[in-house]
Amino acid sequence: MMTGTIETTGNISAEKGGSIILQCHLSSTTAQVTQVNWEQQDQLLAICNADLGWHISPSFKDRVAPGPGLGLTLQSLTVNDTGEYFCIYHTYPDGTYTGRIFLEVLESSVAEHGARFQIP
C-alpha cells in the first residue's frame, strides 16, 4: 500500500529573467527513492537517479541546474516558462508518486517577493 505523500512548493511566482528552485519532498513512507523525474507538461526537464546522477534534457541544459538535493533550479525565466511542473518520484517498493507545482513568471514589477524557495 502506498502511504507516502508529496509536499511541493504549490503555486509559486517568479520574476522574468530570474531563477526559481522547484522542490518536492516525499514523506510518510519508508520507501527508498530511486529516481526523481522533473517534467513540464509532456517534456522531460531532468532526471536525478540516486546511483547514476543527473540527466538534463538538452533543450534545457543552458537554463536548468541540478539541485539543490533532488530539486531543480530553473534560470533565466521567461513568460513561456509559466505552467505546470511535475516531480515524479520513483520509489521501491511503493512505486511512483507525483507532485505538482504551478509556476507563474511575471514581469519584474508584478512578481511576488518571498515565494517559498524563490531565489532573490
Epitope: Q43, L44, I47, P58, K61, H90
Partner: antibody, heavy 119, light 107 residues
Framework: EVQLVQSGAEVKKPGSSVKVSCKAS????????IHWVRQAPGQGLEWMGG????????IYNQIFRGRVTITADKSTSTAYMELSSLRSEDTAVYYC????????????WGQGTTVTVSS | DIQMTQSPSSLSASVGDRVTITCKAS??????VVWYQQKPGKAPKLLIY???YRFTGVPSRFSGSGSGTDFTLTISSLQPEDFATYYC?????????FGGGTKVEIK
C-alpha cells in the same frame, strides 16, 4: 580520444563466474558513469547495470537477481563486471559503455568481450 | 519494466530511399529515448538522443522525433554505410530497456 578497451574472450563452465574488465582512457574517469550491456548471439541489447565512479553508486537490472557485480578501480580507470552462476543463456558479447556528462545516453562503447558458457 | 517495441523488425530499401523506423513504449517515457546504430560484429554507436539531438559526427540525414510513447527515427536518404541494425532505448526509468532492433537491408 575517448577509448574503452575490454579484456579478451572467455570460455566458462556452467555454474562458474566470469569477470570482464574495461579500461578507460582519454577522459576523466570519475566524471562519467560506466554501463554494461550484453547481446546474446543474434539477439538484441540488454542493459545490465551501471557504476558511477563519482560516488561509487551502483545500479543493477533486477533480472540478474544478484548474479552481477559492477566495480571499478579508479586508480587505473578500469571498470569490472562480474557475472556468477553462469548458464548457457549467458553466452553473449558483453559491452561496457560510457554515459555522456549529464546525459543518460551511452556515447562511447568498448569493443565487446565474448563470453561462451559451455560444458 | 517498460517495454520498447520497434517496427518493422527488418526492412529492405535502396540507396536514396527515405526510411522510417518506429518505437513504441509500453508507458509514458516523455522524451527520454535514445537511438543506436549497430553493424555486424561491432559495438553499437550513439546516433540520436532526447530524442531529436544528433550525436557529434552523425550526418544530418538522420533525425529523430516523438514524445510520450511514440518515437520515430528517419533516414532521409539512405546511404550504403547506413545498412545496419537500429535500436531504440528508454532511460525514463530503470531498468533501461531497448527495442528489439530494426535491421535495414539492401533491396
Amino acid at each position: 580520444e575517448v577509448q574503452l578497451v575490454q579484456s579478451g574472450a572467455e570460455v566458462k563452465k556452467p555454474g562458474s563466474s566470469v569477470k570482464v574488465s574495461c579500461k578507460a582512457s582519454g577522459y576523466t574517469f570519475t566524471e562519467h558513469v560506466i554501463h554494461w550491456v550484453r547481446q546474446a548471439p543474434g539477439q538484441g541489447l540488454e542493459w545490465m547495470g551501471g557504476f558511477n565512479p563519482n560516488h561509487d553508486g551502483t545500479i543493477y537490472n533486477q533480472i540478474f537477481r544478484g548474479r552481477v557485480t559492477i566495480t571499478a578501480d579508479k586508480s587505473t580507470s578500469t571498470a569490472y563486471m562480474e557475472l556468477s552462476s553462469l548458464r548457457s543463456e549467458d553466452t553473449a558479447v558483453y559491452y561496457c559503455a560510457r554515459a555522456a556528462k549529464l546525459l543518460f545516453a551511452m556515447d562511447y562503447w568498448g569493443q565487446g568481450t565474448t563470453v561462451t558458457v559451455s560444458s | 519494466d517498460i517495454q520498447m517495441t520497434q517496427s518493422p523488425s527488418s526492412l529492405s530499401a535502396s540507396v536514396g530511399d527515405r526510411v522510417t523506423i518506429t518505437c513504441k513504449a509500453s508507458q509514458h517515457v516523455s522524451n527520454a529515448v535514445v537511438w543506436y546504430q549497430q553493424k555486424p560484429g561491432k559495438a553499437p554507436k550513439l546516433l540520436i538522443y532526447s530524442p531529436s539531438y544528433r550525436f557529434t559526427g552523425v550526418p544530418s540525414r538522420f533525425s529523430g522525433s516523438g514524445s510520450g510513447t511514440d518515437f520515430t527515427l528517419t533516414i532521409s536518404s539512405l546511404q550504403p554505410e547506413d545498412f545496419a541494425t537500429y535500436y531504440c532505448q528508454q532511460h525514463y526509468s530503470t531498468p533501461w530497456t531497448f527495442g528489439g532492433g530494426t535491421k535495414v537491408e539492401i533491396k
